[in-house]
């Protein structure tokens, strides 16, 4: 059997670390056999079999001109092996950042926060954690660890499915290359990662007869689980077209009507959301929906009896992707935010 | 030679932007984590944001949370802070600075003054 | 965030004499501890990384010890070019966190 113990990564292939020195094994002796050393296709020796060295090549101080491949041979010029050396770092401990769209799963995403240079994997666990008093831990087999399964397709993120809304829990991802390994200990609560989808289905209507109204609505994201003690709330923005800053409404439900809103703009309406308890944070913004206030006109009929009533103008606009080019020309009533003057009335 | 150089430092009044670059010679940029640390006049060490070598994951100080946004580009051997809705308290000397790793700095640039100011 | 605290704030020393810098953070941080050294109007430079490793070309007179949550620094022979203000900085969290400092100058 080889002296020489296999690193992880592929075959044939020894690791070192640059400035450093690096030991090379012939692959195909016995342990302690004189070898000669060369460069694939260089003639020069490199270490001579009387260097007492065994069947090993000392690399002092090695750098990327010594990567490459090397070939050992035994006292009767049989070829003991190849190898090939390949430079880099040992792992440093990775970068890992967590995040839950809903109260039953999470997601864990990892990056290196340096780059070895060498093939490397990651190991992914976690363990629920138990807290007995104020400052004691208890590990018990029922608290894991247990591995957080990986994307496929290598994708750096790792899902814990069914954990526990109010559990704290201790993530363990693991850098291994050839040279070491490098672990990351994050500890995270549902609570403080929650972070919803944004609400889906945003529609924003006129309100036939208020020129100054606006019916926004929507639906809860598909991903939260749809389950009555876990609830959202809403925050809804609009503004008009062209202007840059937004007003801000938290809306009781899935609706919000809107009554300042500028006669005869569109007008841009967005919504984020949130656990009811204001467990973790607001979601992003969903997708702009526009929609402009009707209209209201004085009907071409005024009936014979005195009645004083409304009418809306045009048909509601839903969920328009894009703003409709507004008008340049400057609206009368930009400034107006009085609801006493928003219906259009007429007095027989 | 190994270094790194800010630059983008200034007078800002409060409320506006700014952004810092900071440029790294002399190692392979693209391998190592960045961070930003400042230090306000007077006062102590404090760390600002940082980024992976990728640039897919970043962090920042809760003070600098939503306002700033830090960021690379490896093809340049650049990273950025920008800064948005300065507060008189960002003023201070901001420095970048190379991993190793991710919260050790063994290579600091020479930092650049903001000063936020009515 | 994990709080780093610092003492003394400041020091003076002779010439030759031991100095020691303790550093304790608010919970257990194993040995991921850096020491820094700021010289008026320098950039900080790393000294002793991970509690007890010397940082290549920085002197042995410097040298670190401690893991958990209490930490020292020492600089065995004060050397003039030592005056400074030294920074603990803890990295186990993703958010690391400086000491306050310690400013140290020459009796």
């Known amino acids: 059997s080889s002296p020489c113990p296999q690193a992880w990564g592929p075959p044939g292939v020894q690791y070192g670390q640059p400035g450093r020195s690096v030991k090379l094994c012939c692959p195909g002796v016995t342990a302690g056999d004189p070898v000669s050393w060369f460069r694939d296709g260089e003639p020069k020796l490199l270490q001579g079999p009387d260097s007492g060295l065994g069947h090993e090549l000392v690399l002092a101080q090695a750098d990327s001109t010594d990567e490459g491949t090397y070939i050992c041979q035994t006292l009767d010029g049989a070829l003991g092996g190849t190898v090939t050396l390949q430079l880099g770092y040992p792992p440093a401990r990775p970068v890992v950042s967590c995040q839950a769209a809903d109260y039953e799963n999470f997601s864990c995403t990892w990056s290196p926060s340096q780059i070895s240079g060498l093939p490397t994997r990651y190991l992914t666990s976690y363990r629920k954690k138990t807290v007995l008093g104020a400052d004691s831990q208890r590990r018990s087999p029922s608290t894991g660890p247990w591995p957080c399964p990986q994307d496929p397709l290598g994708a750096a993120r790792c899902v814990v499915h069914g954990a526990e809304f109010w559990s704290q829990y201790r993530i363990n991802v693991t850098e291994v290359n050839p040279l070491g390994a490098s672990t990351r200990l994050l500890d995270v609560s549902l609570q403080s990662i929650l972070r919803p989808d944004p609400p889906q289905g945003l529609r924003v209507e006129s309100v036939p007869g208020y020129p100054r109204r606006l019916r926004a609505s929507w639906t809860y994201p598909a991903s939260w689980p749809c389950q009555p003690h876990f609830l959202l709330k809403f925050r809804l923005q609009y503004r008009p077209a062209q202007h840059p800053a937004w007003s801000t409404v938290e809306p009781a439900g899935l609706e919000e009507v809107i009554t300042d809103a500028v006669a005869g703009l569109p007008h841009a309406v967005r919504v984020s959301a949130r656990d009811f308890l204001d467990a973790g944070t607001w979601s992003t913004w969903s997708p702009e929906a526009w929609g402009t206030p009707s209209t209201g006109t004085i009907p071409k009929e005024i009936p014979a009896w005195g009645q004083l009533h409304t009418q809306p103008e045009v048909e509601p606009q839903v969920d328009s992707p894009a703003p409709p080019r507004p008008s340049l020309q400057p609206h009368p009533r930009l400034l107006d935010h009085r609801d006493s003057v928003e219906q259009v009335a007429v007095l027989a | 030679e190994v270094q790194l150089l800010e630059s983008g430092g200034g007078l800002v009044q409060p409320g506006g932007s700014l952004r810092l670059s900071c440029a790294a010679s002399?190692?392979?940029?693209?391998?190592?984590?960045m961070t930003w640390v400042r230090q306000a006049p007077g006062k102590g060490l404090e760390w600002v944001s940082s980024i992976v070598p990728y640039g897919d994951l970043t962090q920042y100080a809760d003070s600098v949370k939503g306002r700033f946004t830090i960021s690379r580009d490896n093809s340049k051997n650049t990273l950025y802070l920008q800064m948005n809705s300065l507060r008189a308290e960002d003023t201070a000397v901001y420095y970048c600075a190379k991993g190793p790793g991710w919260g050790s700095f063994d290579l600091w640039g020479r930092g650049t003054l903001v000063t936020v100011s009515s | 965030d994990i709080q780093m605290t610092q003492s003394p704030s400041s020091l003076s020393a002779s010439v030759g004499d031991r100095v020691t810098i303790t550093c304790q953070a608010s919970?257990?941080?194993?040995?991921?501890l850096n020491w820094y050294q700021q010289k008026p109007g320098k950039a900080p430079k790393l000294l002793i990384y991970?509690?007890?490793n010397l940082q290549t070309g920085v002197p042995s007179r410097f040298s670190g010890s401690g893991s958990g949550t209490d930490f020292t620094f020492t600089i065995s022979s004060l050397q003039p070019e030592d005056i400074a203000t030294y920074y603990c900085?803890?990295?186990?969290?993703?958010?690391?966190?400086f000491g306050p400092g310690t400013k140290v100058d020459i009796k």
């Open positions: 919970q257990d941080i194993n040995n991921y």
């Open positions: 002399g190692f392979t940029f693209s391998g190592y984590s």
């Open positions: 900085q803890q990295h186990e969290s993703q958010s690391p966190t």
């Open positions: 991970d509690a007890s």
